[in-house]
């Protein structure tokens, strides 16, 4: 557990008066329909709010929307609907906010049936002004910004055309027809799939994968017989139909599709799917669905090439293609992921890994909780976390697990304590050490958010009744104060705080209901006066991440190195501030066999850390090997785990084996690729 003082809960002095002076109400002058909120830029304080209201008439639906802008983190809003000519905005496209601090915003308007094309409103000054632009096509998807250049936009049309703009939506050019899916890659590259015959659906498995690196001047076909493709980290994945049957396989490229290797993963049939759960520049977590409608599959983790995969977790809960999985990256501590497995009795259990999928375990039972009736043993059970699946099943879970990179070690989640996830009303649990230990934080379901890099946690009870109370904690959830932010309770719809958890402002959204009407209302509370001073050196303490055995010299070593962080003391009530940067001190660990995965042709017998050569590749799928332009596979049986930084220590050596003769040809070999120019 992270360091903290075990003291009685002390009240934050004069907090009611301090918060009352910093609580700002805004009543929106519209009927309650739907509301969407977007932050424009980072640390700008600019929020756009779009409210829409549909009036169903006998022959058509009449829509009305209003646009509001705040530049003080939501304390005040100005109606700027006139800047978009009082046009009805299509909420299904949302507000397309530009990357980084570009200040760019695109809104897609609703247009009448007979029009030649759609209409957008563009702003490049953080929504101070908008320019109306009529499009030469009807958009099917939201405008997508190039991550490298926010002036470059792409969109698909309702007629499956791929349209590109080089001047932030002022002029558009159709660069290709019959396009199913398009994505920006790195360096302003666009990847897209095309169909030749009927449609995207009809040609599934017979699509072509194309690439353009110059916004449509020239193209290269980089794959055929494509079912789908995806980008993750530095990897480009394509799922490709096999020549012989209806199965398909994952191929991977790390050079933008110039060369491909077949991933050492099981093939899947028509009803199955692959899913990239997480990816970074080092490695990939890949889910492979089981045959049949089981609702589970297997997680595999890749090597640094994305080619060789190790089985990471069996019976991983993932309902259907595009369905629900509880897989969660705990962003507050390196290497930590949480997900759910489906046990043989169809109950759901939570598993956690601290070493990027190397080993999975149950979550430790919180000390201040008792096992519920799902437990076979009253004294031995685990914490089970409610995530996407529970939410989809309409269990009483208002929010998924929450962690923030700059709130080191903090994880907040709904859960139940037993042998499996329970249908009983859940409580809220917190971990301050990245998931190693947990404490019950709040009774019953709540909405929660992290402010000031973990200096404040805010929560609101999930209730069907109107609410007027907010709870906050300045000591990582140990002690809670309650503040009544309004005399008149509101029907709560959501908590909003600036992404990144650096802000000290929280907005409470809801609506008031009177006899004749209901209106949107927001309350923005600034906690700056609660944390009245800036944190100093004495407010921080050293914390070793992943520490489980302080006596062990290798304590805290995960993926070849350990990290010491400066953590805010729980007893310190001070501001980390908007410019707070996580201070960490890494130190390299000695290598052990745990720092290596087994290369292709080798495996780890159970409970053994050594990689052993497979007696022969007979009986194994011969397509499980390296393709592309490599002449032979050179391996010593071990490959360092992606991202592992260990040095010295164990240095496993194996003689090089030439396995090329045991491989078959590649579906995506270079001779099948071609180029063309416009």
């Amino acid at each position: 557990s992270a360091p903290g003082e075990d003291e009685e809960c002390g009240r934050v002095r004069d907090f009611v008066a301090k918060l009352a002076n910093n609580t700002h109400q805004h009543v929106f002058d519209d009927l309650r329909g739907s509301v969407s909120l977007s932050w424009v830029g980072d640390s700008t304080g600019v929020i756009l709010v779009l409210t829409t209201f549909h009036v169903p008439l006998v022959i058509m639906t009449f829509g009305q929307s209003k646009l509001y802008r705040s530049e003080d983190y939501g304390k005040n809003f100005k109606d700027i609907t006139d800047l978009i000519n009082n046009t009805f905005i299509r909420t299904e496209f949302g507000m397309a906010i530009g990357p980084e601090n570009s200040g760019k915003v695109v809104l897609t308007a609703e247009v009448s049936g007979g029009s030649r094309g759609g209409r957008i409103f563009r702003s490049s000054d953080f929504a101070k002004n908008f320019v109306q632009t009529d499009l030469p096509f009807h958009p099917l998807t939201q405008m997508m910004y190039s991550p490298q250049n926010s002036d470059y936009l792409l969109a698909l049309s309702t007629e499956n055309g791929l349209w590109v703009s080089k001047n932030f939506g002022g002029k558009w050019e159709e660069i290709h027809k019959a396009v199913c899916l398009a994505k920006w890659g790195s360096d302003n590259t666009i990847f897209f799939t095309t169909y030749a015959n009927g449609s995207c659906k009809a040609d599934l498995g017979a699509l072509e994968l194309w690439r353009t690196s110059d916004l449509g001047k020239s193209f290269k076909t980089i794959g055929v017989k494509i079912y789908s493709f995806g980008l993750g980290g530095r990897f480009l994945f394509a799922s490709v139909m096999a020549d012989k049957d209806t199965t398909r396989r994952i191929h991977v490229s790390t050079d933008q599709g110039d060369t491909w290797s077949m991933a050492q993963l099981p093939s899947v049939g028509q009803e199955q799917f692959y899913s990239i759960l997480a990816a970074n520049d080092d490695m990939v977590f890949m889910h492979v669905d089981e045959p049949g409608d089981t609702g589970f599959g297997t997680i595999f983790t890749s090597d640094d090439r994305g080619i060789v995969y190790s089985k990471s977790l069996d019976r991983h809960l993932y309902t259907t293609t595009g369905g629900e999985t509880d897989f969660t990256n705990v962003t507050s501590l390196r290497g930590v992921y949480i997900t759910s497995v489906l046990s043989e009795d169809n109950s759901i259990q939570t598993m956690i890994t601290f070493d990027q999928g190397g080993r999975w375990t149950h979550l430790r039972k919180p000390e201040n909780s008792e096992c519920d009736a799902t437990a076979k043993n009253k004294n031995e059970c685990s914490l089970h976390i409610h995530a996407s699946y529970s939410i989809s099943q309409k269990l009483n879970v208002p929010m998924a697990p929450l962690s923030e990179p700059n709130a080191v070690g903090i994880v907040i989640a709904h859960g139940s304590v037993g042998d499996a996830i329970s249908v009983m009303v859940p409580d809220v649990y917190i971990s301050d050490d990245g998931g190693y230990s947990w404490t019950k934080m709040l009774e019953g379901p709540h909405y929660y958010t992290i402010l000031d890099s973990g200096g404040i946690i805010v929560a609101i009870e999930h209730s069907s009744r109107p609410i007027n109370v907010i709870k906050f904690s300045t000591d990582e959830g140990q002690c809670w104060q309650t503040y009544t932010f309004t005399r008149d309770p509101i029907y709560f719809t959501g908590l909003a705080s600036e992404p990144g958890a650096r802000s000290m402002n929280i907005s409470i959204w809801g609506f008031t209901e009177s006899f004749l009407t209901s209106q949107w209302v927001s309350y923005t509370i600034d906690f700056k006066d609660i944390l009245e001073r800036n944190c100093e050196e004495k407010d921080y303490t050293i914390w070793l991440a992943h520490s489980t055995d302080p006596e062990d010299y290798e304590d805290g070593c995960i993926l070849g190195y350990k990290e010491q962080f400066l953590r805010l003391r729980k007893s310190s009530v001070c501001q980390n501030g908007r410019d707070y940067v996580v201070t960490k001190q890494p130190s390299i660990c000695l290598c052990s066999l745990e720092d290596f995965l087994c290369d292709f042709g080798y495996y780890r017998p159970e409970n053994d850390s050594k990689c052993v050569e497979q007696p022969e590749l007979k009986g194994h799928d011969l397509e499980f090997c390296l393709y592309g332009r490599e002449e032979h596979l050179t391996t010593n049986g071990y490959r360092k785990i992606p991202g592992d930084k260990c040095q010295g220590g164990v240095n496993p050596v194996r003689e090089v084996k030439d396995l090329k003769k045991k491989c078959t040809s590649n579906f995506l070999s270079p001779e099948k690729q071609n180029s063309k120019s416009n």
Epitope: S347, T374, A375, N377, K378, K394, A420, S422
Partner: antibody, heavy 129, light 107 residues
């Protein structure tokens, strides 16, 4: 045959505690969950909580949290329900009922509820000063 | 918690007639619903589980239907022993909750 036999009627004063027993027979005691349900005079049924006899783990309805304790004795195949800080509104007939499905959420193969298939005869608890 | 509402509160039916009892949930309970019969001075008896499956030993005149939020218990031809109070109960989300009951009386 499968049977649940409960202890006899009780009369208690406000503030006191009552402990009702429920002895199971005719099936493997530790293999099925047990719920407790009460019924005030002239009123409907109210679920109080559930116990897993295998290890003794429990889950209680929020309304009774802190006042109710469910335990079991595997050697005698008996479950107990103790209700403390009694008040007049706790006057009711208390039933134990076998509840095979338990409370675990289920995967996509959808949780199937089998109902409370066997009930005790009920124990009348009267709270009066 | 999920609120279960039964209607009507009282149903007057002649023997041999059909009785239709209704149960509505405040949110979806899927098919995690059971029906019970209770006679004066007796413990409840399970009739239907999983919304539509008859429990062991329950006559075929009892049938259950529905899924989600709307459920029905039908007694196709009332016998004298069927005059009692009927309760529905959900087990989709804890705490388990019962409807207020429907009393089926002789007309």
């Amino acid at each position: 045959q499968v049977q649940l036999v409960q202890s006899g009627a009780e009369v208690k004063k406000p503030g006191a505690s009552v402990k009702v027993s429920c002895k199971a027979s005719g099936y493997t005691f530790t293999s099925q969950y047990m719920s407790w349900v009460r019924q005030a005079p002239g009123q409907g049924l109210e679920w109080m909580g559930i116990i897993n006899p295998y290890g003794g783990s429990t889950s209680y309805a929020q309304k009774f949290q802190g006042r109710v304790t469910m335990t079991r004795d595997t050697s005698t195949s008996t479950v107990y329900m103790e209700l403390s800080s009694l008040r007049s509104e706790d006057t009711a007939v208390y039933y134990c009922a076998r509840d095979p499905s338990g409370i675990a959420a289920a995967g996509p193969a959808s949780r199937y509820y089998y109902g409370m298939d066997v009930w005790g005869q009920g124990t009348t608890v009267t709270v009066s000063s | 918690e999920i609120v279960m509402t039964q209607s009507p509160a009282t149903l007057s039916v002649s023997p041999g007639e059909r009785a239709t009892l209704s149960c509505r949930a405040s949110q979806s309970v899927s098919s995690n619903l059971a029906w019970y019969q209770q006679k004066p001075g007796q413990a409840p008896r399970l009739l239907i589980y999983g919304a539509s499956t008859r429990a062991t030993g329950i006559p075929a005149r009892f049938s259950g239907s529905g899924s989600g939020t709307e459920f029905t218990l039908t007694i196709s031809s009332l016998q004298s022993e069927d005059f009692a109070v009927y309760y529905c109960q959900q087990a989709r989300l804890g705490p388990w909750t019962f409807g207020g009951g429907t009393k089926v009386e002789i007309k």
